[in-house]
Interface confidence: medium
Amino acid sequence: MAVTACQGLGFVVSLIGIAGIIAATCMDQWSTQDLYNNPVTAVFNYQGLWRSCVRESSGFTECRGYFTLLGLPAMLQAVRALMIVGIVLGAIGLLVSIFALKCIRIGSMEDSAKANMTLTSGIMFIVSGLCAIAGVSVFANMLVTNFWMSTANMYTGMGGMVQTVQTRYTFGAALFVGWVAGGLTLIGGVMMCIACRGLAPEETNYKAVSYHASGHSVAYKPGGFKASTGFGSNTKNKKIYDGGARTEDEVQSYPSKHDYV
């Protein structure tokens, strides 16, 4: 029951996480204009991975997509790639985990198969979450670097004179959505991996069984039948696989007259 709950919760958490990663990737507000000490407050700029927008105090908003690939910074391309890989892996993971859910029966799928699928989806969720966190963190680092460079430029400017305008960009809402979503996907993946351990059937060890005499008075009859002694009620010479049966590991054999030829 606990395993089913862990698996189900892991699936739901990952589902929310991946939905968040998709939302973050599509959002326009990855970076927003820092309006502190900005002389032109009538205009607000914000950028996403796919387009940039301008919003004015009058309500006028205009967005334009990045129609060029060559002119874009390599870091932006890398972030796009990381987010897309995260989404693809997450989507595949979700698909796999649906079939792996213990509460869903598909044909005569064995628990071992479900366990393997759960582990696979768990690993996919973990990698997906890490991709999203990495992508958002790379972008955030890019912003922080540019922000402080811009701040330096504001006070030095061209040829040592004060530069009157310098646009600085800071963290947009998408970054926070991405971080949280990546974290949730990661947690969901870990939960799936934990659930996998509970789903995996116990290994059946078919150990070699040796039949040893319980006492010195016990004789073996041909045909593998245990001789009737005062210890058991096997009067009809039925084949016995329990009682005196012990594995090689469990019993220490004592020498008897039958052990040597």
Epitope: S31, V40, A42, V43, N45, Q47, R51, S52, C53, V54, E56, S57, S58, F60, E62, R64, G65, Y66, F67, T68, G71, L72, P73, N146, V165, Q166, T167, Y169
Partner: nanobody, 118 residues
Amino acid sequence: DVQLVESGGGLVQAGGSLTLSCAASRSDLFISIMGWYRQAPGKQRELVADISRGGKTNYADAVKARATISRDNAKNTMYLQMNNVKPEDTAVYYCYAQISNPFWGDYWGRGTQVTVSS
């Protein structure tokens, strides 16, 4: 690389008018704000006027009644018309553009000299 090219500067008689134009070297740029700044000898650079994509304008008090700023978003060009120019308008006029796409940044032109003779 992006270049902003100013034109229209020169020697102007006091009381006369002048029109400055600024053009971006690429027409595919998404410029949110374009503006004119000026720097008189020994003084700091100051805003003359700026204009947003939506046409919202902002003027310095010194030129408010005498200047008109306009832009063509499709061509990424901007114009500044100044009437009744005064000797104190003598300065190097710089074009400024705040680019949002395909990369972000603030760009300046090399400047054009405007001299008002009395």
